[in-house]
């Protein structure tokens, strides 16, 4: 069902695995990190080289896009269903262009249903990527270029690019434009985690991963 179950069934090697939707036979391919912090992590987002366009439609963010071995978005529908079955933690791992790494760990994470615009719910922040959450609290609805739920008449998804839980427009966007090294500063629509790197700094790499809290 998720990478934690795959791990417990004896598959302890990093890689792409076929997962199934809860209470369903529908399948989805995801990258499983079986090494970091004890393994069992389902990767729900990865940015690393700018090879995939993240300025996508609501439907594409719903079902997922990209390549699980590289840059991808797993899909809001799967993540919503999964995180409403049991309690999950969310870990966000970040890399800058100077060789630094940081993370934010939320001890409870879930997405509401599509009817509620995949609103993000987060509790219990720890980690090295800022003492304040760079995802606005309380969580906001998901927005895309064709699904505007951002608490702003400014259309954050179009201006900042990418789908995200924008809050007029808020201190993060890990699905922004990918800027290569030496072009990554003073970019207002880049890959941003404000309470780590401040504004205008576009990150080198990001990974969002989830795992059951009782793993």
């Amino acid at each position: 069902r998720d990478c934690a179950e795959v791990f417990k069934s004896g598959h302890t090697t990093n890689g792409i695995y076929t997962l199934t939707f809860p209470n369903s036979t529908e399948e989805i391919k995801a990258y499983c990190d079986m090494e970091a912090g004890g393994g069992g992590w389902t990767i729900i987002q990865r940015r690393e080289d700018g090879s995939v366009d993240f300025q996508r439609t609501w439907k594409e963010y719903k079902v997922g896009f990209g390549n699980p071995s590289g840059e991808y978005w797993l899909g809001n529908e799967f993540v919503s269903q999964l995180t409403n079955q049991q309690r999950y933690v969310l870990k966000i791992h970040l890399k800058d262009w100077e060789g630094n790494e940081a993370y934010s760990l939320y001890e409870h994470f879930y997405l509401s249903s599509e009817e509620l615009n995949y609103r993000i719910h987060l509790k219990g922040l720890t980690g090295t990527a800022g003492k304040i959450s760079s995802i606005s609290q309380p969580g906001n609805d998901f927005s895309t270029k064709d699904g505007d739920n951002d608490n702003c008449i400014c259309k954050c998804s179009q201006m900042l690019t990418g789908g995200w839980w924008f809050d007029a427009c808020g201190p993060s966007n890990l699905n922004g434009m990918y800027y290569p090294q030496r072009q990554n500063t003073n970019k207002f629509n880049g890959i941003k985690w404000y309470y780590w790197k401040g504004s205008g700094y576009s990150l080198k790499a990001t990974t969002m991963m989830i795992r059951p809290a009782d793993f």
Epitope: C154, G170, P171, K187, F188, N189, Y194, G198, G200
Partner: antibody, heavy 121, light 107 residues
Amino acid sequence: QVQLVQSGVEVKKPGASVKVSCKTSGYTFSNNGFSWVRQAPGQGLEWLGWISGYNGNTNYAQKFQGRVTMTTDTSTSTAYMELRTLRSDDTAVYYCARDQDYSNFHWLDPWGQGTLVTVAS
Amino acid sequence: DIQMTQSPSSVSASVGDRVIITCRASQGLSSWLAWYQQKPGTAPKLLIHSASSLQTGVPSRFSGSGSGTEFALTINSLQPEDFGTYYCQQANSFPLTFGGGTRVEIK
């Protein structure tokens, strides 16, 4: 409500330095940035640079690079702009203005009341 | 740097007239554009951001339009209190840059 209150009128001689302060109230200082903009008599608006209230990152207009320094004091929610080696054509009203740095929005609202800096021998 | 060119540089209009001020950017801005009003002896005031979003408290006779490189500020039914100088500003990248200003006089 959000307020930016700047320091008073300054009269300086050529070659001197001036430091203008901008004290803020009514919002979370660290969520925002500050631009400094000047306006010479009868002229338009000229951007000098920007500083983040969160981590002190700065970006200066090339014209003022090496001559301007922007700083913040989070304990007093105050931003500062120092301009060195003043010339007569630096005579202007200097404004501080807030932006929504954490949202990457660099439109300016509100503005301070302005500080008139006169450079004359 | 992104150059902002405003036109006209001044306009004289009667109360009730429609006034249109244009702003052209030297490169595409998406919607990263703001408009300000400045009256003599006072600081500029934000009217519109994101090219077309009216700032809270600004009368609805002001509107903004455009994206990319061409933008416009429209004042529908000009009022006596609308005199002053209007500036556009790009917020797409540093350095922030302003247009040269448009002076609006009431006939």
